[in-house]
């Protein structure tokens, strides 16, 4: 009878048990972005390192062509940090002249693409006005939350301006997901 | 045959099952830092509360001497928030005089130390330029991501300037990790 | 004997096994806030969408009257992002006149209410001074950490100024929790 203390009761377990070490997981890190054309009103997607340094994918979570592929339906925690850096924005010059203005901004979006849906779904957005006056500035935007995903869904990270992304260190800009 | 719906198939489970409540976990909260000398080019490590208030360590995850000790290999979610506060930086005065300048900055790094490695590994970095003009400023930097850690690894949180860390409330500055 | 590789040993498991898909989880998304009275020195609580779009509650995690109800004791990861937006603060005007001043600020607090406790407990706080000079500004505050909660605990998100919360998109302002 000793084993019964570990035996899940019918009330407790509604799905097959599975070992945690077997769950789809990925942590991707920044790489220098290759120049690519993107449509004017569409935020470009970042591409990522998936196996060197701190980066990894495991248990059928695969990375291909800017996308993380979801191999199994379930609830996933998804996160990303993008560190932006830039020189003084137009904003500050206009401001110094005493005229109010629409601020420059930096934005990160984690997007889900489902092949059967015509439109991508924005899961998470971090957006910040940037009106810096020093000669250069830098700052991170961090996002993270839980979503119910379906097998075959694809995840990507889009940014408002790819040229402002700090690609110099794997700990500054990253993207990850894991099945809960 | 009823029990079979809970029985893991060979395809599903590649590691022993284990109860979630038994996993190494810690949430550490800020304490006032003691006066210490630190080397000029090295970011000082914060020390933490590990048992009072909201803080805890459990299931062999131990805190000692500024380090979280990893008791078991696996994938961990690691997070920290540091709230910084300060008075107007030199930056703003130079700026007001109309000369651009290198901004002051605040930085948080979550670092892994592996005894067999000569150099610590920076897992996560949040860094932000600070060019504030009001008479005082405050802001948080949040970090969180998943990493594959080995038994015996040690985690710490380093900051660019320990004197700017807001130590006044346990909900403002904290550090945690849990095995997935 | 083949099954033994999956059988938890007495050392490994101290609690009943349970399927991950059965754990209490919620992701709530922003809705437009209805004007409500709140006490002067008390931050108002946000109310949330719990079933439309990206929002969901599952496995006995219920949302009612601004609160997430914790159905089962255990360690939970709790997170929220609030995106704030506003027009130029008084702060910048005073500053331009050359007089230093106490900055305006934006604050998010994740609060736990336990019926047997007279006082709510602040679990997480993100607070930021806002001294923007552009004609409008926007920025997120993100929080997330792990806490030991008891069955019956209630969670809410409080903000310093409800009128500054960006309620326009479900990916900008959100609140979630899941049992680890």
């Amino acid at each position: 009878l000793k084993g019964q203390e570990f035996a899940p009761s019918h009330q407790q377990v509604y799905a097959p048990l599975r070992a945690d070490g077997d769950k789809p997981r990925a942590h991707l890190t920044v790489v220098r972005q290759t120049p690519t054309q993107h449509f004017k009103n569409q935020f470009p997607a970042l591409h990522w390192e998936h196996e060197l340094g701190l980066a990894f994918t495991k248990n059928r979570m695969n990375y291909t062509n800017k996308f993380l592929l979801i191999p199994e339906s379930g609830d996933y925690f998804i996160y990303s940090q993008v560190t932006f850096r830039g020189m003084t924005s137009e904003c500050s010059e206009i401001r110094q002249a005493g005229r109010p203005n629409k601020p420059d901004s930096i934005t990160v979006v984690i997007t889900k693409v489902t092949d059967s849906y015509p439109e991508p779904t924005q899961l998470l957005m971090g957006t910040k006005s940037v009106c810096e006056v020093g000669s250069n500035w830098f700052q991170p935007i961090y996002l993270g939350a839980m979503f119910s995903l379906q097998e075959g869904d694809k995840l990507m990270v889009n940014v408002s301006d790819i040229s402002l992304v700090d690609y110099t260190k794997e700990d500054k800009t990253f993207f990850g997901a894991f099945l809960l | 045959l009823k029990g079979q719906e809970f029985a893991p198939s060979h395809q599903q489970v590649y590691a022993p099952l284990r109860a979630d409540g038994d996993k190494p976990r810690a949430h550490l909260t800020v304490v006032r830092q003691t006066p210490t000398q630190h080397f000029k080019n090295q970011f000082p490590a914060l020390h933490w509360e590990h048992e009072l208030g909201l803080a805890f360590t459990k299931n062999r995850m131990n805190y000692t001497n500024k380090f979280l000790l990893i008791p078991e290999s696996g994938d961990y979610f690691i997070y920290s928030q540091v709230t910084f506060r300060g008075m107007t930086s030199e930056c703003s005065e130079i700026r007001q005089a109309g000369r651009p300048n290198k901004p002051d900055s605040i930085t948080v790094v979550i670092t892994k130390v592996t005894d067999s490695y000569p150099e610590p590994t920076q897992l996560l970095m949040g860094t932000k330029s600070v060019c504030e003009v009001g008479s005082n400023w405050f802001q948080p930097i949040y970090l969180g991501a998943m990493f594959s850690l080995q038994e015996g690894d040690k985690l710490m949180v380093n900051v660019s300037d320990i004197s700017l860390v807001d130590y006044t409330k346990e909900d403002k500055t904290f550090f945690g990790a849990f095995l997935l | 004997l083949k099954g033994q590789e999956f059988a938890p040993s007495h050392q490994q498991v101290y609690a009943p096994l349970r399927a991950d898909g059965d754990k209490p989880r919620a992701h709530l998304t922003v809705v437009r806030q209805t004007p409500t009275q709140h006490f002067k020195n008390q931050f108002p609580a946000l109310h949330w969408e719990h079933e439309l779009g990206l929002a969901f509650t599952k496995n006995r995690m219920n949302y009612t009257n601004k609160f997430l109800l914790i159905p089962e004791s255990g360690d939970y990861f709790i997170y929220s992002q609030v995106t704030f937006r506003g027009m130029t603060s008084e702060c910048s005007e005073i500053r331009q006149a050359g007089r230093p001043n106490k900055p305006d600020s934006i604050t998010v607090v994740i609060t736990k209410v336990t019926d047997s406790y007279p006082e709510p407990t602040q679990l997480l706080m993100g607070t930021k001074s806002v001294c923007e000079v552009g004609s409008n500004w926007f920025q997120p505050i993100y929080l997330g950490a792990m806490f030991s909660l008891q069955e019956g605990d209630k969670l809410m998100v409080n903000v310093s100024d409800i009128s500054l919360v960006d309620y326009t998109k479900e990916d900008k302002t959100f609140f979630g929790a899941f049992l680890l």
């Epitope: - | 830092q33 210490t36 506060r85 300060g86 008075m87 008479s135 300037d161 320990i162 | 230093p100």
Partner: antibody
Framework: QVQLVQSGAEVKKPGASVKVSCKAS????????INWVRQAPGQGLEWMGW????????GYAQKFQGRVTMTADRSTSTAYMELSSLRSEDTAVYYC????????????WGQGTLVTVSS | QSVLTQPPSVSGAPGQRVTISCTSS?????????VLWYQQLPGTAPKLLIE???NRPSGVPDRFSGSKSGTSASLTITGLLPEDEGDYYC??????????FGGGTKLTVLG
């Protein structure tokens, strides 16, 4: 109103120890750090360290490390500062002060305790 | 270890304005929590006058004001009164989280 009331004057011999008390009233004792500052006759102020009465954690100035011990008795809302291995240069008025958490200012001060070290 | 330097003494007639400076040996003075000023009247404990460079706690007259420029902070007293006579100390917290006091400035009100 907030009050910090310190123990009376002490005369000690070199090599001895002294323990000065600071009884707090008019506020929640565990919510504010207590600092100790001393002032030698005709001299300026010198910071010795801080005590968190809630946790018992302390931070001492480099100069006093190994010689000073700060403690609290929460049941009586009293902070203590003990200085050992006294020498003549330790002759001073010793003040306790309550610190404002947000600004780290010493907002309320005790009346001071004169400690004289003389053989 | 940084040091805060104050002039040993200043003086002024009643009604006049005096300024006491506090200069840091390090690059920025009180970057974390600013500079605080205390008044110590003869035979009494110090009293907080200014926190965070500029801010007066309630009960402190607006004749007292603080300012900052680069590595220096200043306390200005306008409309000097005889009862202002005493010692004035600046204080800040250094990078090692130790509190530093200036050497103190003796204010004499003439006449």
């Amino acid at each position: 109103q907030v009050q910090l009331v310190q123990s009376g004057a002490e005369v000690k011999k070199p090599g001895a120890s002294v323990k000065v008390s600071c009884k707090a009233s008019g506020y929640t004792f565990t919510s504010y750090d207590i600092n100790w500052v001393r002032q030698a006759p005709g001299q300026g102020l010198e910071w010795m360290g801080w005590l968190n009465p809630n946790s018992g954690y302390t931070g001492y100035a480099q100069k006093f490390q190994g010689r000073v011990t700060m403690t609290a008795d929460r049941s009586t809302s009293t902070a203590y500062m003990e200085l050992s291995s006294l020498r003549s240069e330790d002759t001073a008025v010793y003040y306790c002060a309550r610190e404002v958490p947000e600004t780290a200012a010493f907002e309320y001060w005790g009346q001071g305790t004169l400690v004289t070290v003389s053989s | 270890q940084s040091v805060l330097t104050q002039p040993p003494s200043v003086s002024g007639a009643p009604g006049q304005r005096v300024t006491i400076s506090c200069t840091s040996s390090s690059s920025d003075i009180g970057a974390g929590l600013g500079v605080l000023w205390y008044q110590q009247l003869p035979g009494t404990a110090p009293k907080l006058l200014i926190e965070g460079y500029y801010n007066r706690p309630s009960g402190v007259p607006d004749r007292f004001s603080g300012s900052k420029s680069g590595t220096s902070a200043s306390l200005t007293i306008t409309g000097l009164l005889p009862e202002d006579e005493g010692d004035y100390y600046c204080q800040s917290w250094d990078g090692t989280l130790s509190a530093l006091f200036g050497g103190g400035t003796k204010l004499t009100v003439l006449g």
